[in-house]
Every structure is written in C-alpha cells, then in structure tokens.
C-alpha cells in the first residue's frame, strides 16, 4: 500500500502490468484482466444503501500517485490499496472500510436518533 505522505512522482515501468479487474474492467480487458503502465488496485466503498462494494482494476501511471494515496473524503467511506510488485497482485489486496465516525451519523443524509 502506498503511504499517505508519499509525494514522489511515479516512475514509469519498463513493461506492462496485468491486473485483475472487477466492476472496473475497461473495454480493452480480456477475461477480467486489464493492462496498465501504472498500478493494480482494489477498492472498497459503501454504495448508496450503505453496503460495501469491492472493485478492482488498473490505474494508469498518469494520476495514479494521487489516486493510490488513500486520502479521506468527507461523508464517504472508502479505502483503496495499490500494488505493482507482480501481475494480478491486487488479488491479494484486502482494503477495509474506515470506521464510522460519530459525525458521519450527524452530517450524513440519514439522521439516526
């Protein structure tokens, strides 16, 4: 997983990386495998009904440094992990949803009493 504070520009890979893709397969993927010059990722987030949804796929080198930094987004429970060490490395990534904060209940669209 990339560290939150990491700010170095990503180094171009000399070769293509293959990743597992699920719910996030581009048109040029085959048999749920996509290819990239950047990173493989697995992400977990809540859908509109509050259920956890896992997606995985490829991130292009351009912009992936930012996307792989797991920056908290207000009112959104989401976690992403990225890898490059081998093909389909994202099969072994298991991000977990960050814990609910009290203010999530107050500020969210549904008010709990």
């Amino acid at each position: 997983k990339k560290e939150d504070g990491e700010s170095t520009a990503p180094t171009p890979r000399p070769k293509v990386l293959r990743c597992k893709c699920h719910h996030h397969c581009p048109e040029d993927s085959v048999n749920n495998i996509c290819s990239t010059d950047g990173y493989c990722f697995t992400m977990i987030e809540e859908d509109d009904s509050g259920l956890p949804v896992v997606t995985s796929g490829c991130l292009g080198l351009e912009g992936s440094d930012f996307q792989c930094r797991d920056t908290p987004i207000p009112h959104q429970r989401r976690s992403i992990e990225c890898c490059t060490e081998r093909n389909e490395c994202n099969k072994d990534l298991h991000p977990t949803l960050p814990p609910l904060k009290n203010r999530d209940f107050v500020d969210g669209p549904i008010h709990h009493r």
């Epitope: 890979r13 000399p14 070769k15 990239t36 093909n87 389909e88």
Partner: antibody, heavy 116, light 112 residues
Framework: QVQLQQPGPEFVKPGASVKLSCKAS????????VQWVKQRPGQGLEWIGE????????LYNQNFKGKATLTVDTSSSTAYMQLSSLTSEDSAVYYC?????????WGQGTTLTVSS | DVVMTQTPLSLPVSLGEQASISCRSS???????????LHWYLQKPGQSPKLLIY???NRFSGVPDRFSGSGSGTDFTLKISRVEAEDLGVYFC?????????FGSGTKLEIK
C-alpha cells in the same frame, strides 16, 4: 547490446514435441516480457503468447492454448516454448522477442520443420 | 480479435521517391491508459523484423528521420520521405492494445 539468441533449425516428426529456446543478454531479463511469434512461409506474423520472467505469468493467444507452453529459467536468462502434438501446420519460423509495451528486439528465429 | 488491414500489399517505388503505407484496425487502438499501441516493423529477406516506429509516431533508436508515423484511433500511416535501397523489404503494422496482439499482413516495398 540487447540480444535474443535462438538456435538453428529443428527437424521433428509429426506427433512429437519440441522445446525451443531463447537466450537473452544485454538487459535485465526480469524487467521485460518475452513474447513468441509464429511466421509461416509467405504468410504474416501470428502472436502465440508471452511470459513475464519476474513471476512466470503467462498470456496465450487462444489459438495456441494446448499447443504452446511458455516457461523461463531466470538463472540462465533463457525463455522456452514447448510445442506439442506437432503437425505440418506447425512448420514455421518461431521468433522470441522482448516486450515492454511493444516489441523492440527480436531473436533471429528458429525454423521448425515437421515432416515424417 | 483486432484485424489489422494494410494497404497496399505491394508498393513499387523509385529510389528517392516518397512511399506511404496505410494500416487500419477493426477497433480503436486507444488503450484505457490513453496510449495508442500501434507500431511499425521492417522485415528484410531472411531476417527477423526490426522496430521502426512505436506508439504511432515515435522513431526507435537508430531509425533514420526519413521514416515517420502518424494517425489515431483506427487509421495509421507510415511514410518514407526518400526511399533508399536499404529500405526494401516487408513492412508490418502491429497493435499491442488488445490481447491477442495482432499484425498487419505486410506491405512489400520494391523497386519500380
């Protein structure tokens, strides 16, 4: 300089198997994929598949699944392609090639002749 | 599979003349990363192919500047501004956007 060395011609009988080799030098073997390409006389080029020597990950053209098996030996920087149940249709020149996002260097090719 | 259609199949030219080869793909070759993986190779008789142009328009190291590539999406062109004797052979286009990777059927450049 980058080199992919392939041995001379191979002559085999129908039904047999053959293992073609490709010795890489002049670069870090695990930093690039190795692809294999078939060329029949007077015909075009046909992509067989590729292997990533860093993790032995393979991708095959569906047309060659069950026909070709790709392996590597990282200690000798050598890639191999085994072709099984050979028929006259397998007679061709087989090239190995270095692949990053495109093929930049090719071996000189091994001519395979399948004949009784 | 992506079909790569090259025209013409044979191209007779005089030395010093310009030559132009077209390559058309059955699907867009723009990859999801934004790159277009369309490449050109020259195969001389009895030799293995040699890379000329990668990713549409980038000349490979050591390739003379009389070779240029252009195009986008599904339509691509290789131009040789002044043909020299050493340029004779078969030119192939190739795509590495979609698996399985595929090649054009080749264009034979020959002396008129």
């Amino acid at each position: 300089q980058v080199q992919l060395q392939q041995p001379g011609p191979e002559f085999v009988k129908p039904g047999a198997s053959v293992k073609l080799s490709c010795k890489a030098s002049g670069y870090t073997f695990t930093s690039y994929w190795v692809q294999w390409v078939k060329q029949r006389p007077g015909q075009g080029l046909e992509w067989i598949g590729e292997i990533d020597p860093s993790d032995n990950y393979t991708l095959y053209n569906q047309n060659f699944k069950g026909k070709a098996t790709l392996t590597v030996d990282t200690s000798s920087s050598t890639a191999y392609m085994q072709l099984s149940s050979l028929t006259s249709e397998d007679s061709a020149v087989y090239y190995c090639a270095r692949f990053g996002f495109y093929v930049d260097y090719w071996g000189q090719g091994t001519t395979l002749t399948v004949s009784s | 599979d992506v079909v790569m259609t090259q025209t013409p199949l044979s191209l007779p030219v005089s030395l010093g003349e310009q030559a132009s080869i077209s390559c058309r793909s059955s699907q867009s070759l723009v990859h999801s990363t934004g790159n277009t993986y369309l490449h050109w190779y020259l195969q001389k008789p009895g030799q293995s192919p040699k890379l000329l142009i990668y990713k549409v328009s980038n000349r490979f190291s050591g390739v003379p500047d009389r070779f240029s590539g252009s195009g986008s999406g599904t339509d691509f062109t290789l131009k040789i501004s002044r043909v020299e004797a050493e340029d004779l052979g078969v030119y192939f286009c190739s795509q590495s956007t979609h698996v399985p990777f595929t090649f054009g059927s080749g264009t034979k450049l020959e002396i008129k």
